[in-house]
Each structure stands twice: as structure tokens, then as C-alpha cells.
Amino acid sequence: GDLLIQKTIKKQVVLEEGTIAFKNWVKTGTEVYRQFWIFDVQNPQEVMMNSSNIQVKQRGPYTYRVRFLAKENVTQDAEDNTVSFLQPNGAIFEPSLSVGTEADNFTVLNLAVAAASHIYQNQFVQMILNSLINKSKSSMFQVRTLRELLWGYRDPFLSLVPYPVTTTVGLFYPYNNTADGVYKVFNGKDNISKVAIIDTYKGKRNLSYWESHCDMINGTDAASFPPFVEKSQVLQFFSSDICRSIYAVFESDVNLKGIPVYRFVLPSKAFASPVENPDNYCFCTEKIISKNCTSYGVLDISKCKEGRPVYISLPHFLYASPDVSEPIDGLNPNEEEHRTYLDIEPITGFTLQFAKRLQVNLLVKPSEKIQVLKNLKRNYIVPILWLNETGTIGDEKANMFRSQVTGKIN
């Protein structure tokens, strides 16, 4: 009996036309939502003039439906038992699941000012930037709508650069009508224990953002894992959002709509400094902001963002060192709300429910030559927003799953 079930499972989780896995893999049957909370800065003038702590107040959720588009350019390679694809990006605002509209205004860090002053650190160009910032009446902070902040706006300061430069700025710009990939993953035909594991991303087995093992593309994309998941396993996955591979460990048994699933969570150790977790040494890319690699809980992904000083963390700086959150007032981290988890059906390896949480921050530093940054006396890793991307198997799919998979085993 068990062998027959194993055989059936192995057959059905292969990523090829005709299997249950393939159908759900090409286009997820789960509704996925991405909720945003924006950190509205309450005291922009005091920060700019006196280098005060930044007082933030989160506003949200603002909810978008995401991951509703089918994978594109799906191409099987029989020779190396892989399937390649592009994951198209799309986001549709859901007013009924949001506290306001996309036209709501927020006071946030001026993305262009912070980024340009970081990218061009030489004194001469900073003098030029100062002229452009002043002329455009830009400042350290700006007021932007939700739509502008997320999806892009024409920046008045960058628009003054007399060369062809990208003048559109947005945390997720460009997003709609773009795609992530190309991913090339093992289809499991020859070896089911490799199914969904990424072979290459954008044609490479490494990212070129990090040193050593940190640069590896490990595991799957977290939508599924090879079948017969054990509680003792460390589940590796790659997330292009954070420009790195990461891992999850078993936390608890959960009953999801009558289906027994394993809850895997991202442990605090994954965000630890190299002092506590030596494996993380290669995620420490500079010595000043990281206080000689002793700070933890923030990841400098600037190399992955064309030099823009983007730092990824968990929401409200959960699992981050006190020095990171010290200059920011108004944060209240808690595990239940702010950690990432995956609920995995162990027999198939399918992720039936998940909550992926992350925070986007931008570094801003004092600059002697840029007037609006001149009075700063310290570096700030400024929280801009945090997001919660969730998906749960639908009732109909859950019934099907219970009858066809877990019911048969029990």
C-alpha cells in the first residue's frame, strides 16, 4: 500500500504536462496577496535639522493581488531533466482589503536623494548633486502617494541631470509587465528528490552578489519542495526579492483545513551576525554600517540593486541588533506578526500556506556637501515599508487534496 502511494506521489509531483503538480505549478491555484504597511515619518524637519530619532507610524494594510499570472516560456529540456520558465509580475490593488486608496499620501525618505548621495560619494559630484537637489526643491524627505512610492514616479531632482539617466524611481519599479527569471529547475523525472530545485537563475548557478557560499542559488523557490519532507530537514530556498538563498527549519505540526502540514520558519540564526553564526560572514559586505560585522538583522543588497543602498530586514527590525532600530521610534517587532513561515504538506512537499514577511529599508548618511543631509550626525537605516505576502490553499483544493492525498494515506 505504502509503496503504491509513494509511487503515485512520485509520479504526480514531477513537473511535466499531465501531473497535478505541473498544473498547479504553471499557474498557482492559490490566491496570493501582498499587504503593505508604509512607515509614515512624523518628524521630517527635526530629523533633517537636528539628526533626531526618526518617528514612524505604520499605515496599512494596502493590499494587492499578486502571482495570478501563469508562468511564461515554459520549456522542458529532456536532456538534463529540467524545465525553464519566466515568472511574470503583476499586482492588482484590492480596495476592499485595504485601509485606503493608492492615492493616500505618505511622508517617506527621498529615495533619489538617499540613493544618489550613496552611489556618488566623491566630494565633487556631491557638490553637483547639492545644486540639483536645491534647484528641484527636493529634501531629505518627500510626500508621495502609495502608487508613486511602490510603482514609480518621475523624480524632479534626477530629471535635472543633463544626461540620459533613469528618472523614474519607485521601490518596486519596474514591476507590472516585467518577469522574474529565467529560472531553470529540475523536473524530477530522473530523480524525484531534485524536483523543483533550481539548477540556474538567469543562466547562472551563482548570483555574483556575494562571496563564497553566500552567492549560491540553493533549493527551490519555496512554492514546493521535493516530496517526503522530514521534520529534521533544513529547507533551502532562493528568494529573488532578497537577492539570496535562505533556509527554514521545522517549528510545529499544524492542521490546515484538515490537512496535516509542517510549519517551517525562518530562524533568527539566519539573520544573525557572523559573530553568532559564522556561516553568515559572507553576507557582511562592509565594515562601517555593520559595525565591523557585529550588527545583525539587516542585509545590504545594494550590489543587487545597482548600488542603491537598499537594506532588507524582517518587519519592525525583528531579530535585528539594537543599534539598527535605536535611531527609529515607533517600531514594535513581534514574532507572530513579523516572521516568515511556510506550511508544507510533507508527502507531496507542496507549500499549502505561507506568509513571507520582509521590510525594505534605505540607508541615508550625512554629507558635508549636500545641504539637506549636512546636519545629520549619524547613519540611518530608514524603514520605508514592510510587506506580508500570503497564500492559503482554497477550500475546494483542500478537499481535493484531502481526498486524493492525505485521505488515501490515513
Epitope: 559630484v125 545644486s131 536645491n134 534647484k135
Partner: antibody, heavy 117, light 107 residues
């Protein structure tokens, strides 16, 4: 086509004044800012002054600070270098040059300033 | 101020020769270095910016390398029109400063 044309050079006595002009075409000087660079006879290049984009700040080499003033008239798309209290060591060919990121991609033909009694 | 020290101050070479001119900055200027060519009685012409980026219209026999404090301009195969004086310049900090020049003469 980008062009810079200097004028206003000539012979002047020590302690005298001269005003150089730099007429630009093919680009807006306000967007780039303008530099003056000089070259004494048989010598190398020396940066003299800069007016930052959009009528921004002005900057000078220590050797001319307090004596030279750079300015621009954006309506005429022309930059100026007012030179007062001239000295023999100010004798040079004066070039105006376009730059944004600090390297000079276009230069004028130069105008000779001779300070001699 | 950042000093730019060029060497040699002059050199003699023949058509077809590979010529290398070096420039040393008194402090780190990252890649913010430009190179110019100047012929007698003419204004300088930009060859290279950002230490390695060839300016449009400049022949590919000219190349730049270096970062930090040490920079090189190389002419892979000297042509008759290349006999001139060459200057390096740092565009990292004000005041912008030039090297003293290297005169490339016919051997």
C-alpha cells in the same frame, strides 16, 4: 552641435581688470555649469573656477580666490570670468569648458590674457 | 588638494610603438580620473573618463586602466597624429587637479 567660444582676452597692466566671456551653444549652461581652466605659456593645465549647475555655488582655485568672480547669464547662455587685481602670473590662455561629472568633454578655443607693464 | 603626478614628463617613441603613461594620485580617487590629449596651440581633447571609459569618437588604440591611486593611459600602436602632450586629471574632489603632462615626441 556643442560649441564654446571665449572672448575678452588681451593685454592688461598688473593690478588691472578684465572680463572674459564664454558663449555656449548646443546645450544649456544652466544644466551643466561651466569651468574656467588656464594654461600659462609652456606650462600645464590649471583649473581656475567653476559655477555649479542651475546658478548654484561658485568655487575657485586658491590662487585666484578673492580676485576672480565667475558668473552666468542663462538668458544669454553665456558664462563670465571677472578678473581683478591681475598679476604677471595670471598670464595664460584661458579656456572655458563644459563638465557635469568633473571631466571636461567640450572646450572653447581659448583666449590669451597677458598681464604685463 | 589632491596632487596628480604624471610620469614620464616626456618620452620618444616611433609609429607603431606601444606607449604607456602613468599617473599617481596623492590620495584615493576611486575611478574618477580623466585623460586628455593636447596639441600645440589647440584646446585639450577628452580621451577617457572614469579611468577606463573611452570617450565617443576616440580611437580604440587608446585605453585607460587603474583605480584608487595608480592610473595608466596606454596607446597600443602609436599613430603619427598621436604625437602630443597628454594630461591626467582627477574629477573626484574640488579643486579639480591635473597632472603636469607627458609630451610624446617622435623618436
Amino acid at each position: 552641435e556643442v560649441q564654446l567660444v571665449e572672448s575678452g582676452g588681451g593685454l592688461v597692466q598688473p593690478g588691472g581688470s578684465l572680463r572674459l566671456s564664454c558663449a555656449a551653444s548646443g546645450f544649456t549652461i544652466a544644466a551643466f555649469g561651466i569651468h574656467w581652466v588656464r594654461q600659462a605659456p609652456g606650462k600645464g593645465l590649471e583649473w581656475v573656477a567653476w559655477i555649479a549647475p542651475y546658478g548654484g555655488d561658485t568655487y575657485y582655485a586658491d590662487s585666484v580666490k578673492g580676485r576672480f568672480t565667475i558668473s552666468a547669464d542663462t538668458s544669454k547662455n553665456t558664462a563670465y570670468l571677472q578678473m581683478n587685481s591681475l598679476r604677471a602670473e595670471d598670464t595664460a590662455v584661458y579656456y572655458c569648458a563644459r563638465s557635469f561629472f568633473g571631466y571636461f568633454d567640450y572646450w572653447g578655443q581659448g583666449t590669451l590674457v597677458t598681464v604685463s607693464s | 588638494d589632491i596632487q596628480m603626478t604624471q610620469s614620464p614628463s616626456s618620452l620618444s617613441a616611433s609609429v607603431g610603438d606601444r606607449v604607456t603613461i602613468t599617473c599617481r594620485a596623492s590620495q584615493d580617487v576611486s575611478n574618477w580620473v580623466a585623460w586628455y590629449q593636447q596639441k600645440p596651440g589647440k584646446a585639450p581633447k577628452l580621451l577617457i573618463s572614469y579611468a577606463t571609459s573611452l570617450y565617443s569618437g576616440v580611437p580604440s588604440r587608446f585605453s585607460g586602466s587603474g583605480s584608487g591611486t595608480d592610473f595608466t593611459l596606454t596607446i597600443s600602436s602609436l599613430q603619427p597624429e598621436d604625437f602630443a602632450t597628454y594630461y591626467c586629471q582627477q574629477h573626484s574632489n574640488a579643486p579639480l587637479t591635473f597632472g603636469q603632462g607627458t609630451k610624446v615626441e617622435i623618436k
